[in-house]
Every structure is written in C-alpha cells, then in structure tokens.
Interface confidence: low
C-alpha cells in the first residue's frame, strides 16, 4: 500500500495556493444580522458564489505558504516535496496495526461509489462533532449527514476529488485506518477514468481527533490542472454547508431542502504534487463556547451570539442554522447581554432534545442547491447495491423523511 517515497521535485520559491470564495453566498450584512433569509437574499446568495482569492503570506523558507482564510475556520499549510514535514505527514498504512486497517471491498473495485463509515471518535469538522462520514471512490470524503444527488458539491474533505475508478486496476484499493485518534483514508494506486495511461495516483486524507485535517500525496503522476472536470468535478480542499427547509409551494405541508455552502477552501491544484502535503489546523468557533459569558466575550473573528433558548453560541452560520432560525435566535440575541437571561428559566423554553433540524421532505433538487457546481451533476452512488428501500439505511439516525434515491 505504501511504496517508498520517490525523489520529489523541489517546489522552489514563489509557490503557494489560494483559498477561493471562502465566505460563500453571504454578504457582510447577512453575516452580522443572521435572520430568516428572504427571497431577494436568496437571489443574492446565488450571485455571491464567485468569491475572491485570498492573500498569501510567505514563510521565511519560501517553500511553505500559510493561508488563513477570511472566515477563520482553519489555518492551512502547504508543504512542498522538499519539505521534510511532508513525509512526516504521510501515514504509512502498511505499517499500521492490521486490525485497524480495512480494505473496502466495494470501493476498491467499483467506480463512482460511496460508502458510509463510522468513526471511533467524534471528529470536529467546522466545529461540528461528526461520528460518521462517507468515503467516495472519487478521492473525497463526504461529511454531510443527509445524502443527496450531488455529494461532490459541498460538505466535503477532498484531497483530490476527480473521476477515479478503482475498479480499473487490480492494484487499486481504497483503504481506511482508524486507531482511535486518527482516521485515514488512502486512495491507493487509483487511475483516472479515461486517463489510465497517465499512471496511478496514491494519496490520503487524515482526520485527527483534534480536528486537524491532513492531505498527503505520494504519487501524483500528472499535472492536476490538466485533469478534465467534464465528467466529474475536480477539487482539492474543504467545504461545509447548512440546510434550510423551505415550504414547498406545490405541497404546503411538505418542506423543500435548500443547501447553502457557507464556507469553502480551495487549494491551487498546481500545488498538488507527488510528496507534497497540506495540513489544516482548526481555529476556535462560536460553537465551542458553552456559556453565555464565554460566548459574548469571545475574541473570535466570528460575530458570536448566545441563544438562550437553545443554550448555544453561534454566528448563525453553521449546520444548526435551521434551529437558529426556527427558535428566533437572531432576534433574541439582538442587543441583549448575558445578565438579561439570568432571570429566565430556559428549561421551560428549551426545545425537545430530539428535535432535528433536518426533519421533513428530503427531496433535494438541483434548483434548490445554491452552489457553484450545478453544471456537473455527479452520479456518485452512496451504496452500490441499495435494495428496494433505496438509501434509508444510510441516513443519519436522526434524519427522518423520504430519502433521495440515487439509483444504482
């Protein structure tokens, strides 16, 4: 699984990567006063997707670039082939305890498939503790808990999202490793569909229990910008989104799910080379604060507000936004201080703990996805042999409703 590192080329000075459009779909006003999104704002959301390119700071050694994105979820460091640390970040799965390494039967032998895996620890992703993720053959991990037709669109950890087909070669495998403190997925000797003559790719994504994410690249046989995105998106980076339930005009009692990507980091694909690595270190978020005082006094770049009824600290832009809106948290927090909540009995107003922000109709259509990759509808399937019940067994236990059937 892990051939010895080959001689990588020196990245040289003047290189780096860009984090593009990191505050996707929200203008500053909306961020500062997160209320219910009106129709005009939704139009604006879809127009805001362009985003900008962030500045890059050069470290003294001129080989490593550090970018702190402007929403401060992660600090990201790129290590070029000549950096000793890039080798240290590679997890040698072959040397790991065999009981902790799994070769995924389906993913190793098929194309455009994805499979749910349960982690042995809670992994904090954008501040949200996740226990299950979905590994895809296409070089990425889907981090969402509601499956839809476009897994490649958002909520991903993508060391190199592309049209990989592990079924092409007898040497290709998708393996994962979980030792309780780190979860590693390795796409090993996988080939690009239609570009098999270019050679095989070997790379991995590591999710650390402290929230760090590492992309390590062992074999990248071609220039990543040359990879065609006509059949499958090509991306490297992180993305997260929240979901909003909107009443459906056709069926009043049903609610349509809209997916809003609120943050994305995109690496410069030209910097993804053999023996390079990227490390994402999480920064504090509002969600980590457990009390009103800690929330309101936090010195984060986020505009944290305390929602008394939910007993939650939030910027209003995270996966719990539906609850934040449903319980009027934006209005509640307006101009209030922590002392104002002292006399209130929050227990009587607390929502049912079983409340799910994702209850309702799960039928997500392309038109309700405010994301910038609508041109390429991905057909990655969650399960290669979903039976008559479709995907019902692959949804989060807290998710109810009719699942989207991806087909097989």
């Amino acid at each position: 699984l892990s051939p010895q590192p080959g001689a990588g080329h020196d990245e040289g000075p003047g290189s780096g990567w860009a984090a593009k459009g990191t505050v996707r779909g929200w203008n500053r006003r909306a961020r500062e006063s997160p209320g219910h999104v009106s129709e005009p704002d939704r139009t604006q959301l879809s127009q805001d997707l362009g985003g900008g390119t962030l500045a890059m700071d050069t470290l003294p050694d001129n080989r490593t670039r550090v970018v702190e994105d402007n929403h401060s979820y992660y600090v990201s460091r790129l290590y070029g082939p000549s950096e000793p640390h890039s080798r240290e970040l590679w997890v040698d799965v072959a040397e790991a305890n065999r009981s902790q390494v799994k070769i995924h039967t389906i993913l190793s032998n098929t194309h455009r498939q994805a499979s749910r895996v349960v982690l042995s620890f809670d992994f904090p992703f954008y501040g949200h503790p996740l226990r299950q993720i979905t590994i895809a053959t296409g070089g990425f991990i889907f981090m969402g808990d509601v499956i839809h037709r476009m897994l490649t669109a958002t909520q991903y950890v993508a060391p190199l999202m592309a049209n990989f087909n592990p079924g092409y070669s007898d040497n290709s495998t998708v393996v994962y490793f979980d030792n309780g403190t780190v979860f590693v997925v390795q796409w090993d000797h996988v080939y690009l569909q239609g570009w098999e003559d270019k050679g095989s790719f070997t790379f991995q994504a590591a999710l650390h229990h402290d929230g760090r994410i590492v992309f390590a690249y062992k074999e990248i046989p071609m220039s990543v910008p040359e990879i065609s995105s006509s059949q499958h998106p090509v991306k490297t980076g992180l993305s997260d989104a929240f979901m909003i339930l909107n009443p459906s005009p056709d069926v009043p009692e049903s609610r349509r799910r809209s997916i809003f990507e609120y943050h994305r980091i995109e690496l410069d694909p030209s910097k993804v080379t053999s023996m390079s690595a990227v490390e994402f270190t999480p920064l504090p978020t509002c969600l980590q604060h457990r009390s009103c005082d800690a929330c309101m006094s936090s010195d984060l770049t986020f505009n944290c507000s305390w929602c008394h009824v939910l007993q939650r600290c939030s910027s209003g832009f995270d996966r719990y936004r539906q609850e934040w809106m449903d319980y009027g948290c934006a209005q509640e927090a307006e101009g209030r201080m922590c002392e104002d909540f002292q006399d209130e009995d929050h227990d009587s107003a607390s929502p049912d703990t079983s409340f799910s922000p994702y209850d309702g109709d799960l039928t997500t259509t392309s038109s309700s996805l405010f994301i910038d990759s609508l041109t390429t509808e991905d057909d990655t399937k969650l399960n290669p042999y979903a039976g008559g019940d479709g995907l019902q067994n692959n949804l989060s236990p807290k998710t109810k409703g009719t699942p989207v059937h991806l087909g097989t």
């Epitope: 799994k102 389906i106 895996v117 349960v118 007898d170 290669p384």
Partner: antibody, heavy 118, light 107 residues
Framework: EVQLLESGGGLVQPGGSLRLSCAAS????????MSWVRQAPGKGLEWVSA????????YYADSVKGRFTISRDNSKNTLYLQMNSLRAEDTAVYYC???????????WGQGTLVTVSS | DIQMTQSPSSLSASVGDRVTITCRAS??????LNWYQQKPGKAPKLLIY???SLQSGVPSRFSGSGSGTDFTLTISSLQPEDFATYYC?????????FGQGTKVEIK
C-alpha cells in the same frame, strides 16, 4: 443455465499440494469476481479467497495466505485454487462461487472434497 | 477481522411459524450483509443481499432488515422446505466473514 463445476479434490498428505479448478458456464465469466469458500465437515462456511474479473487483484483469508493462490483463465472460463503446504485443518468441501450483488455469492458450485491426512 | 455472531445457534419450529434469526457484526457494516440457506449435502443458496434485498427466485416469505451492526432474517410462515441452516455474511471489508450458522429444525 448459469453453472459452476469444481474438480481436483481428493486425498493428499500434510505438506502436499493440490490444484482445484472451477469451470464456469452460462454467463460472461470475465465480468465477474469469483471466490472460493470452504466448509470443514460438520462446520460452518469459511471464505478462502477472491479474485476480480481482470485477474490479478486477489484477496485471501489469513489462514491460507502464503500457501494458497487463486487465479483465473478468462479465455477458458476457469477459476483455479493452487493449494500448497496443506494441513489437516484445510480438510473441507471447497466451493467455487460467483460474486455479485455487492459481494454476495449468488451462484455456487456443488463443491469438491479435499482431505488432508497421513 | 469483523466477527459475525448469529443467534440462536439452533431453533425448533413448526410449519407456519414465524421465525426470526439475528446476526450481529462486531463493527458497523452499513447494509453490507447477505443471508444464505444451506441444506445438508448441498451448496449454500443466496436469499438476501444488501441486508434487505430479496435475491431473484427466493420466496417472498423471506425478508431481511437491519443496518449497522444488527440484522435480522425473518421467515414469515415457515414451510417444510425451509428447514435448513442459515448463515449471515458481511461483505463490508476483507476478509469476508460468515456467522457460525443457525440450524432451523422441525419441532
């Protein structure tokens, strides 16, 4: 009709070798992954090895790794299991099975008995 | 390796009874689970794949359910030809593993 027919079983001494064959018919053999599953007398089923359609991508149970080799000849629609360094605990009925439906064994041969005894 | 544990190891039932066999995986295997029936001297037969999908040609009295670690095979109304040994098998990761089997006998 889809059929799998094993052959090559028999009595062999410990440390000896045996080669099992499985002739497939009624389906496009090269399109399917194939596997060997065994069953010791009076015991349950034990997966032994698997090989994918193109040949070459192989997997083995720990109990046979390094001793058994699975292979296939797609031109002859035949699956093989080369068994070396046989042990008494390898005594079993060996089934050839087609892998389908998400790695379920949907077609089985009738089995061939391998007895390892001195 | 993923261990598959079936219960009960054997059961006695009468024709027409509703029979339930359970299978537990030592770790989450999503719905990568198959069920087989085997009669003495015969090769196993695939009944259910992907935890709940009925294999072509298998009577509808057989059904499967479950996801994650706990799975169930149900025979809604036991027929004389159903007396056999039943095995579950995970196809989530290598090595592929079977349960120890559940023998269904005539009461």
């Amino acid at each position: 009709e889809v059929q799998l027919l094993e052959s090559g079983g028999g009595l062999v001494q410990p440390g000896g070798s045996l080669r099992l064959s499985c002739a497939a018919s009624g389906f496009t053999f090269s399109s399917y992954a194939m596997s060997w599953v065994r069953q010791a007398p009076g015991k349950g089923l034990e997966w032994v090895s698997a090989i994918y359609g193109a040949g070459g991508k192989t997997y083995y149970a720990d109990s046979v790794k390094g001793r058994f080799t699975i292979s296939r000849d797609n031109s002859k629609n035949t699956l093989y299991l080369q068994m070396n360094s046989l042990r008494a605990e390898d005594t079993a009925v060996y089934y050839c099975a087609r892998i389908s439906h998400g790695w379920g064994f949907d077609v089985w041969g009738q089995g061939t008995l391998v007895t390892v005894s001195s | 390796d993923i261990q598959m544990t079936q219960s009960p190891s054997s059961l006695s039932a009468s024709v027409g009874d509703r029979v339930t066999i359970t299978c537990r995986a030592s770790q989450d295997i999503s719905n990568y689970l198959n069920w087989y029936q085997q009669k003495p001297g015969k090769a196993p037969k695939l009944l259910i794949y992907a935890a709940s999908s009925l294999q072509s040609g298998v009577p509808s009295r057989f059904s499967g359910s479950g996801s994650g670690t706990d799975f169930t095979l149900t025979i809604s109304s036991l027929q004389p030809e159903d007396f056999a040994t039943y095995y579950c098998q995970q196809s989530y990761t290598y090595p592929l593993t079977f349960g120890q089997g559940t023998k269904v006998e005539i009461k």
